[in-house]
Amino acid sequence: VPRWRQQWSGPGTTKRFPETVLARCVKYTEIHPEMRHVDCQSVWDAFKGAFISKHPCNITEEDYQPLMKLGTQTVPCNKILLWSRIKDLAHQFTQVQRDMFTLEDTLLGYLADDLTWCGEFNTSKINYQSCPDWRKDCSNNPVSVFWKTVSRRFAEAACDVVHVMLNGSRSKIFDKNSTFGSVEVHNLQPEKVQTLEAWVIHGGREDSRDLCQDPTIKELESIISKRNIQFSCKNIYRPDKFLQCVKNPEDSSCTSEI
């Protein structure tokens, strides 16, 4: 008789989750010499320990501390790129502009990117059937708490000019409920961060509006200013050209506004 198990509203743990994490860890530590000291088995043991045998709606940041400790990494604090609802372009950008880093360019972000995971209370099993949905089930689930924890630490580490890429195609260009709006904005350190520079990415080819005047951007400016951090904003009218010009800055067409 199969044992009754909690049915959550979200998708279950990503297939082959443990091996995926382990393989990503090995790949990352081999590509990044400064992380060669990391023992990937220990990283997996700590990752597993954060959620295995625990109720998947009762996960805390404390549960992830052993993993955070093992994944401690120094990135240039003035080369941080945050993003909201436009992950792919942000990642394409840092793949070209190799001296800038998104969270997913760090070990811990790289390990978990696009993965889902959860366990079950009082059993050592990984739940491959379903995991809690942030809205429908609970917010203190393993995935949400992980991203909240690493995002907070990433924002806290930032200094000087911090960049954020925002999706100009969305109704809320700045969304207070996004990870950027609810975690990262509030954990930038005013004593270290001088300016937050927003890059608003336009979707339509003929979209020539100044999206930096959008009410949600003004709301972001207000929040940032109240935290004694300067704010600036740029429209990226042509994201394809923007990337091309990052790759080839000498190109004659790159002197005009992107």
């Epitope: 382990l22 860890c25 088995q41 997996w44």
Partner: antibody, heavy 123, light 110 residues
């Protein structure tokens, strides 16, 4: 050519200790997890212990927990198994084996095995 | 008593196809990979199949692995006299943090 050479086996009395060694060559030892697997006379394979490439993580079979300790010296390309409080049921050929993929041991097949060293626990 | 159950013996004539089964539970084989090892008489084990159905280089394609639910199988086609050996299935159990071996199957080529 990848080679693993076990040594340190022998006859020991119950309650005694023994330290097995496994000298590795032909590959970058510090990049791979390593295991000990044993085989009692006329019996099947029984996994004993495993250690990650950098030695930061180990795991042992319940039957040897608290008695056996796996360790490695990456500068000497050598794997060890310290066996204390030995029992008659520990009598076996002990094999050391290399992990197939780099660094970790979870889900990582043992792709190269040594020829084994014999441990006999008897009074 | 092994957690993975294999038949103690199997046999076949040269040229025949034989299969060896390995039965587990929904806490190991069902969710984890299966590995197969061959141990020729008086020698160390040799990796034959990894991650359910992958063959390491040097292993003839006569050997194949498959898995369905809580059972795995090793198939040997075109049986040869040198295939006479003990065959072990194994799986890594991440819950126990340990390798589990089947009891082994002695294959006799008649």
């Amino acid at each position: 050519e990848v080679q693993l050479l076990e040594s340190g086996g022998g006859l020991v009395q119950p309650g005694g200790s023994l330290r097995l060694s496994c000298a590795a060559s032909g590959f970058t030892f510090e990049d791979y997890a390593m295991s000990w697997v044993r085989q009692a006379p006329g019996k099947g394979l029984e996994w004993v212990s495993v250690i990650s490439s950098k030695g930061g993580s180990t795991s042992n079979a319940d039957s040897v927990k608290g008695r056996f300790t796996i360790s490695r010296d990456n500068s000497k390309n050598t794997l060890y198994l310290q066996m204390n409080s030995l029992r008659a049921e520990d009598t076996a050929v002990y094999y050391c084996a290399k992990g197939m993929e780099r660094q970790y041991y979870s889900y990582n097949a043992m792709d190269v095995w040594g020829q084994g060293t014999t441990v006999t626990v008897s009074s | 008593q092994s957690v993975l159950t294999q038949p103690p013996s199997a046999s076949g004539t040269p040229g025949q196809r034989v299969t060896i089964s390995c039965s587990g539970s929904n806490s190991n084989i069902d969710v984890d990979y299966v590995y197969w090892y061959q141990q020729l008489p008086g020698t160390a084990p040799r990796l034959l199949i990894y991650k359910d159905d992958q063959r390491p280089s040097g292993v003839p394609d006569r050997f194949s692995g498959s898995k369905s639910g809580t059972s795995a199988s090793l198939a040997i086609s075109g049986l040869q006299s040198e295939d006479e050996a003990d065959y072990y299935c194994a799986t890594w159990d991440d819950n126990l943090n340990s390798w589990l071996f089947g009891g082994g199957t002695k294959l006799t080529v008649l």
